[in-house]
């Protein structure tokens, strides 16, 4: 079982390989000096049907380096960064993992593209392994709350309350969504 020639790349090169390309072979892409690699640089020859070989993902691309590009902080609700830090310049990558009791959909890594957007795929999502969700929490008088998403919230996520200036928060500042679908505490109040 073998794979066909790896997909070509413009303004870059492919690592050495011999033919036939055996299943298990890795080929690596790189870009010419003034270009930045966007996407996974390694492709693996696999077989899904034990008959034909296929490459496990699309080839990356080489973008002409844009020194003015910068990407915003990427947020994945229920997830956290395991690699990558600000500032995010053209070609920089960020890799995510999911919190406990969350599973990942999509690709764990994204790259800062010349258009100031993360790609070449969408940001991954972290989905709760529990079907239960906690209901949306109410806003409080003279205060605000921040949550990692809007509406009902998956177990493992939290909401943080704060009060307007001149008001004191009474109760729990951070309330966690439990795996039971219940909140860990009642909303606090803001008192003068």
């Amino acid at each position: 079982i073998s794979c066909g020639s790896p997909p070509p790349i413009l303004n870059g090169r492919i690592s050495y390989y011999s033919t036939p390309i055996a299943v298990g072979t890795v080929i690596r892409y790189s870009c010419s000096g003034t270009f930045r690699l966007i996407g996974e640089k390694s492709l693996l020859c696999i077989t899904k049907d034990k008959v034909d070989g296929t490459w496990d993902k699309p080839a990356p691309k080489c973008e002409y380096f844009n020194k003015y590009s910068s990407c915003p902080e990427p947020i994945v609700p229920g997830g956290y960064k395991i690699r990558g830090s600000t500032p995010y310049r053209h070609g920089d990558s960020v890799t995510f993992a999911c919190k406990t009791n969350f599973s990942m959909n999509g690709n764990k890594s994204v790259w800062c593209q010349a258009n100031n957007m993360w790609g070449p795929t969408r940001l991954p999502t972290c989905v709760s392994v529990f079907p239960l969700e906690c209901p949306a929490l109410p806003m409080i008088h003279n205060g605000h709350h921040t949550s990692e998403n809007v509406g009902s919230i998956a177990p493992g996520l939290s909401v943080t309350y704060s009060c307007e200036s001149g008001y004191l928060l009474v109760g729990e500042k951070i309330i966690n969504c439990l795996s039971s679908g219940k909140w860990s505490a009642v909303p606090p109040t803001c008192e003068e």
């Epitope: 690592s15 050495y16 299943v23 298990g24 390694s42």
Partner: antibody, heavy 119, light 106 residues
Framework: QVQLVQSGAEVKKPGSSVKVSCKAS????????ISWVRQAPGQGLEWMGR????????NYAQKFQGRVTITADKSTSTAYMELSSLRSEDTAVYYC????????????WGQGTLVTVSS | EIVMTQSPATLSVSPGERATLSCRAG??????LAWYQQKPGQAPRLLIY???TRATGIPARFSGSGSGTEFTLTISSLQSEDFAVYYC????????FGQGTKLEIK
């Protein structure tokens, strides 16, 4: 960080086989490749082959083709290297090593297993 | 297979001085090169990958450079714990290691 713990030292007779294990803890066993690298006494490092557990695909260095078998048990997060038709020149420390996402380099190594081949 | 040649076989340097280790590939390997440190009785430890990127937790005194066929590992100011054997490894086409350079105290 992934920890790789290997089985203990072995003494073998020429012509026999040896099977060394490498148990991984931490990280997702299926998502990385495990290579086997050996080092004869006072010598350098020599790549023998590697397996990608999630695919069950093993590849071997030409020198060891036909004599080495690398397998993995996903249920126990353990990789195995079996070397047959042993000769005295196979006396070495055998290491398992992990590469992440087909990176090509080894972030984590086992502690090594000394295999002595002697009559 | 791609042959990796390291030089010198042994390098004697005084603590606090700079050490420069070389690695040559038998054909172009782009930047697909890693450096490892190995001390007696221990497994190798990853220092540098992609020719010039320091691995997590590796001190800034270690730096790598080069691409194509010529590569260098530089240790800017040698500490006592840096005396060891250093190996380069290519991953352009499967995997091969250099024969090693022993860095010893002068």
């Amino acid at each position: 960080q992934v920890q790789l713990v290997q089985s203990g030292a072995e003494v073998k007779k020429p012509g026999s086989s040896v099977k060394v294990s490498c148990k991984a803890s931490g990280g997702t066993f299926s998502s990385y490749a495990i290579s086997w690298v050996r080092q004869a006494p006072g010598q350098g490092l020599e790549w023998m082959g590697r397996i990608i557990p999630i695919l069950g695909i093993a590849n071997y260095a030409q020198k060891f083709q036909g004599r080495v078998t690398i397998t993995a048990d996903k249920s126990t997060s353990t990789a195995y290297m079996e070397l047959s038709s042993l000769r005295s020149e196979d006396t070495a420390v055998y290491y398992c090593a992990r590469e992440d996402d087909s990176s090509g380099y080894y972030q984590d190594w086992g502690q090594g297993t000394l295999v002595t081949v002697s009559s | 297979e791609i042959v990796m040649t390291q030089s010198p076989a042994t390098l004697s340097v005084s603590p606090g001085e700079r050490a420069t280790l070389s690695c040559r590939a038998g054909q172009s390997i782009n930047s697909h090169l890693a450096w490892y440190q190995q001390k007696p009785g221990q497994a190798p430890r990853l220092l540098i990958y992609d020719a010039s990127t320091r691995a997590t937790g590796i001190p800034a005194r270690f730096s790598g450079s080069g691409s194509g066929t010529e590569f260098t590992l530089t240790i800017s100011s040698l500490q006592s714990e840096d005396f060891a054997v250093y190996y380069c490894q290519q991953y352009e086409y499967w995997y091969t290691f250099g024969q090693g350079t022993k860095l010893e105290i002068k």
